[in-house]
């Protein structure tokens, strides 16, 4: 875009403590706003500043300022991502797993010096309060993951920040929002019982203990009914269920029955992230030749 | 007197694209924003994104953003819009206005509105 | 985004009544810097593109006859027409102009008996 030669805004930056988006105004405009992000803007107290609520310190965000007349803007980054170009933590990635432990992975740039030492934060969306990572993974010294085994300073979408320091060059940072409900890794199903009469076998199990208050509807099960002894390649059955209120599942199986397994794994609805398979459970008998299920 | 003159209605296909045209006169063009504003048949209205004519910067609503693009003509005082991958939801009538002097935001002139159809 | 919500969605009023419309705003249109109220009203007229019509709640756009005049504060505002005229038959919209995407209300259209 033409550079204006005589810019009636001037100077802008960030007053970070005070969170007053400032600026040098060199004429008369008629009004003027700032925008964050183009997510979303605000009027300027009297053509002098805008007063924001919630900056992030760490968090690269563009504001820009606009005039109504004449027609003008201009922005600045807050704060500035500065370091050497492909020195910050990369391939990151958390996953909460036995609903309340979670681990974060990361590694190094790849132009990070060897002296290189990176540090995880990370800050709920309430932005009250942040959590230091409690416990680093390490690879020759370096940290290249966290193990959190308390989560009680997350909500439902978290801002994680990699830091690094290096005593030779600046270390860029690494950012990412991440919604808790995307990196849970569910337990599989546990209490998984099997039970048949003459007709039927009912199966019945437990959902999974997690992080996120889910109700029995939030949950899609798959139950894997597996003959024994059969030929390999042979199809499993593998049967979708709905969360309930009661998890069960019976289906026709007369007596006599082959022996045969089932193990269960669960997933969020919405994500359809699956979980490992639980223990099968046998049942039936050894007999080869009795009937399928 | 200001004017704001769109060009024609477009019947266009699913997964075309349509450029439309806004010549405005009557006032010094670079003064003021050209802004865009969509209306579905029947329903409410949707800003678009605006342009600042003297350097082609933009500002557009994030709903709109990949799927239109704003640019100007200085010299003929035209303001253009492009639209990308049409579906039928973007079957509406398509106004360009031009800002007010005291705020950026505010719709102060329109022109006639060009209708788009997107029809297989 | 500020949702914008416009009740009724449509009245019938005769000639020379006086008519109201309410437009409410999920979040708070009033600037405390300069204590204004970001909100905007426009009409629109059957086959004509909409009209500017009232700014900062109740600053009538020049041109704009008397008998319109907008009020209220915050998240809560009405446009009155004192004495209804043939030619006021039209859709009137509220604009949330406070911040990004200044999203529109679903309109209040009008008819005349």
């Known amino acids: 875009t033409k550079e204006d030669p005589n810019p009636p805004i001037t100077n802008l930056r960030m007053k970070a403590k005070a969170q007053q988006l400032t600026w040098d105004l060199n004429r008369n405009v008629t009004d003027i706003e700032c925008v964050k992000d183009a997510d979303y803007s605000m009027p300027a107290v009297n053509n002098s500043y805008c007063q924001f609520g919630a900056i992030s310190l760490c968090e690269v965000t563009n504001y820009t300022v606009r005039v109504a007349n004449p027609p003008f803007s201009t922005w600045i980054l807050f704060p500035e991502n500065s370091g050497r170009e492909g020195t910050a933590a990369q391939n990151f990635s958390c996953f909460i797993y036995n609903a309340d432990l979670m681990n974060c992975t990361w590694a190094r740039g790849p132009t990070a010096p060897r002296d290189v030492q990176y540090f995880l934060y990370i800050r709920n969306s309430k932005r009250r309060r942040e959590i230091r990572c409690p416990y680093y993974i390490q690879d020759s010294g370096t940290h290249v993951g966290c193990h959190l085994d308390n989560l009680s300073g997350l909500t439902s979408r978290n801002y994680f920040l990699v830091n690094g320091t290096s005593r030779e060059i600046g270390i860029q940072f690494f950012d990412s929002l991440l919604d808790t409900k995307k990196i849970e890794r569910f337990n599989p199903p546990s209490n998984v019982t099997v039970r048949c009469n003459t007709t039927h076998c009912l199966v019945r199990w437990k959902q999974p203990r997690t992080y996120q208050k889910l109700s029995y509807l939030d949950f899609q099960y798959q139950l894997d009914v597996h003959r024994k002894n059969t030929q390999p390649g042979t199809e499993n059955l593998l049967i979708n269920v709905s969360g309930d209120l009661e998890n069960r599942y019976n289906f026709p199986s007369s007596e006599p029955r082959a022996k045969h397994s089932v193990k269960i794994r669960a997933a969020d609805v919405r994500i359809l992230n699956w979980s490992s398979w639980s223990e099968a459970i046998e049942f039936g008998s050894d007999d080869g030749n009795l009937g399928s299920v | 007197e200001v004017q704001l003159q769109q060009s024609g209605p477009e019947l266009v296909k699913p997964g075309a694209s349509v450029k439309m045209s806004c010549k405005a006169s009557?006032?010094?063009?670079?003064?003021?924003?050209m802004k865009w504003v969509k209306q579905s048949h029947g329903k409410s209205l949707e800003w678009i994104g605006d342009?600042?004519?003297?350097?082609?910067?933009?500002f557009y609503n994030q709903k709109f953003k990949g799927k239109a693009t704003l640019t100007v003509d200085r010299s003929s005082s035209t303001a253009y819009m492009h639209l990308n991958s049409l579906t039928s939801e973007d079957s509406a009538v398509y106004y360009c206005?031009?800002?007010?002097?005291?705020?950026?935001?505010?719709?102060?002139?329109w022109g006639q509105g060009t209708l788009v159809t997107v029809s297989a | 985004d500020f949702v914008m919500t416009q009740s009724p969605s449509s009245l019938t009023v005769t000639a020379g009544e006086k008519v109201t419309m309410s437009c409410k705003s999920s979040?708070?249109?009033?600037?405390?810097?300069?204590?204004?109220?970001?909100l905007t009203w426009y009409l629109q007229k059957p086959g004509q593109p909409p009209k500017l019509l009232i700014y900062?709640?109740?600053t009538r756009e020049s041109g704009v006859p008397d008998r319109f005049t907008g009020s209220g504060s915050g998240t809560d505002f009405t446009l009155t027409i004192s004495s209804v005229q043939a030619e006021d038959l039209a859709v009137y919209y509220c604009?949330?102009?406070?911040?990004?995407?200044?999203?529109f209300g679903g309109g209040t259209k009008l008819e005349i008996k």
């Open positions: 206005t031009r800002s007010h002097l005291l705020r950026a935001s505010w719709f102060a002139y």
């Open positions: 009557g006032y010094t063009f670079t003064d003021y924003y």
């Open positions: 342009i600042i004519p003297s350097n082609g910067a933009t």
């Open positions: 979040q708070s249109l009033l600037n405390s810097g300069n204590q204004k109220n970001y």
């Open positions: 900062w709640a109740s």
């Open positions: 604009q949330n102009d406070y911040s990004y995407p200044y999203t």
